[in-house]
C-alpha cells in the first residue's frame, strides 16, 4: 500500500486504511506534493497581512504586509510597523536616531556613522540621522604634490570640512610667499 | 472572481462523439484538479471524471470508463471531456467544477437521442 | 461504491422555521462531507465542507453537523430565497457520489 500512496498526486491526501486511497484535498486545504497523509489548511492573509497568492488545492497561500508594514522571517511569518528614515523601531513605538547614529531605511536598526579616522581618511560629509558620513581622502593625500587614488569629492554645499580649509590656507600662504619672493626677485634685478 | 464556462454541449445521436470544453478564469487553474460532474434532468449529481493539477493522474466513473477522456491545457487555462459511444443515459447537464467542489461552472446540456 | 442517501425527498416549511435534513453514508467518510444548494435552472453552490465548515459568504443560518456515517444540515430560520434543492456529496474517497437530493418548497 506504501507504493499506492504514491500514487496519490498533489491536490489529494493518501488513506492507507482503504483500497481507494486518494482523496481530494477539501476547499481551503492543500497538498503540494503526491503521496501526503494529510492534506495542510491553507494560510489566511488577515489582519497586517494581505494576500500574494491565493491558496490552491496543490499550494498555500502567500502573504504580504498593508500598506505601513513590512515582512519579518521566513515567508513573512511577521508584519512590523514601518518608521520612517531617521527612526528605528522601540517597544514605544518609532523613535528618532541618537546623535552618532543613522537609518537609511523604513526598518531596522539605528547604526554608528563610519568612522573615518580608522581608516586613515576624513569626513567629507557629516552625517545626519538619515545618512551615514561620507569619508574623503586621508590628510596626508592632501599635502601638495601627493598623487592620489581616491577619486575627485564630488561637488558639495558649503560647510567644509577643517582638513579642506587648512589646505587651502596653506596652499593660499605659500602661493603669496612665491609671489612676494618673485617681485622682490624682479625688484633686485631692475635695481642692477 | 472565479469563473468556469462549459460549452460543446448539444443533440447527438446514440454511438457519436462530442467534445465538451471549459474555460477557466479568475485563479490559478494550473494549480487546480478538475472535475466533470453530471445532472441527468430531474435527477441527482453523479461524478464523471476527475484529472490531477499537471494532468497525470485521472480517474473514471465506472460508467463512462473506456468511452470518455478527461485531458486539460494549462496554458489555455481549459478544460476537456471527449466522449465516444453516447448512449442516451449520457444525456444530462455537464459542469465542471475544481476540485475542491467549491466552484461550478454554469453547465452545458447534451442530449443523445436519435 | 460509497452511497449517500437522503432524507426526506422534499418538505414544505414557512418563512422563519427550523429546517433539518439528513444524509447516511452507507459506510465511515469521517468529516469529508459536503452540502451544496441548487436553485431551480442553476449550478450547486457550496454551502458546507467538512462537514461543518460554513464556506465563504454562507449566511450563518446554515449549520452543517455530523460525522462518520450521519450528516445534518439545518436551517435555523428558513428565508424564502432558500427554495431549493440541497444534496450532500462525499469526498473520502473515488468514485465522489452525491445524495439524490431534497428539494425544499415553501407552505
Known amino acids: 500500500l506504501q507504493d499506492l500512496c504514491s500514487n496519490c498526486p498533489a491536490g489529494t491526501f493518501c488513506d492507507n486504511n482503504r483500497s481507494q486511497i486518494c482523496s481530494p484535498c477539501p476547499p481551503n486545504s492543500f497538498s503540494s506534493a503526491g503521496g501526503q497523509r494529510t492534506c495542510d489548511i491553507c494560510r489566511q492573509c488577515k489582519g497586517v497581512f494581505k494576500t500574494r497568492k491565493e491558496c490552491s488545492s496543490t499550494s498555500n497561500a502567500e502573504c504580504d504586509c498593508i500598506s505601513g508594514y513590512h515582512c519579518l522571517g521566513a515567508e513573512c511569518s511577521m508584519c512590523e510597523q514601518d518608521c520612517k528614515q531617521g527612526q528605528e523601531l522601540t517597544k514605544k513605538g518609532c523613535k528618532d536616531c541618537c546623535f552618532g547614529t543613522f537609518n537609511d531605511q523604513k526598518r531596522g536598526i539605528c547604526r554608528p556613522w563610519t568612522n573615518c579616522s580608522l581608516d586613515g581618511k576624513s569626513v567629507l560629509v557629516n552625517g545626519t540621522k538619515e545618512r551615514d558620513v561620507v569619508c574623503g581622502p586621508s590628510p596626508a593625500d592632501l599635502s601638495p604634490g601627493a598623487s592620489s587614488a581616491t577619486p575627485p569629492a564630488p561637488a558639495r554645499e558649503p560647510g567644509h570640512s577643517p582638513q579642506i580649509i587648512f589646505f587651502l590656507a596653506l596652499t593660499s600662504t605659500v602661493v603669496l610667499f612665491l609671489l612676494f619672493f618673485l617681485v622682490l626677485d624682479y625688484k633686485d634685478d631692475d635695481d642692477k | 472572481e472565479v469563473q468556469l464556462v462549459e460549452s460543446g454541449g448539444g443533440l447527438v445521436k446514440p454511438g457519436g462523439s462530442r467534445k465538451l470544453s471549459c474555460a477557466a478564469s479568475?485563479?490559478?487553474?494550473?494549480?487546480?484538479?478538475m472535475h466533470w460532474v453530471r445532472q441527468a434532468p430531474d435527477k441527482g449529481l453523479k461524478w464523471v471524471a476527475y484529472?490531477?493539477?499537471?494532468?497525470?493522474?485521472?480517474y473514471y466513473a465506472d460508467t463512462v470508463k473506456g468511452r470518455f477522456t478527461i485531458s486539460r491545457d494549462n496554458a489555455k487555462n481549459t478544460l476537456f471531456l471527449q466522449m465516444t459511444s453516447l448512449r442516451s443515459e449520457d444525456t444530462a447537464m455537464y459542469y465542471c467544477?475544481?476540485?475542491?467542489?467549491?466552484?461550478w461552472g454554469q453547465g452545458t446540456t447534451l442530449t443523445v437521442s436519435s | 461504491n460509497i452511497v449517500m442517501t437522503q432524507s426526506p425527498k422534499s418538505m414544505s416549511m414557512s418563512v422563519g422555521e427550523r429546517v433539518t435534513l439528513s444524509c447516511k453514508a452507507s459506510e465511515n467518510v469521517g468529516s469529508y462531507v459536503s452540502w451544496y444548494q441548487q436553485k431551480p435552472e442553476k449550478s450547486p453552490k457550496l454551502l458546507i465542507y467538512g462537514a461543518s465548515n460554513r464556506y465563504t459568504g454562507v449566511p450563518d443560518r446554515f449549520t452543517g453537523s455530523g460525522s462518520a456515517t450521519d450528516f445534518t444540515l439545518t436551517i435555523s430560520s428558513v428565508q424564502a430565497e432558500d427554495l431549493a434543492d440541497y444534496h450532500c456529496g462525499q469526498s473520502y474517497s473515488y468514485p465522489l457520489t452525491f445524495g439524490a437530493g431534497t428539494k425544499l418548497e415553501l407552505k
Open positions: 467544477a475544481r476540485d475542491w467542489v467549491d466552484y
Open positions: 484529472i490531477s493539477s499537471g494532468g497525470s493522474t485521472i
Open positions: 479568475g485563479f490559478t487553474f494550473s494549480e487546480f484538479g
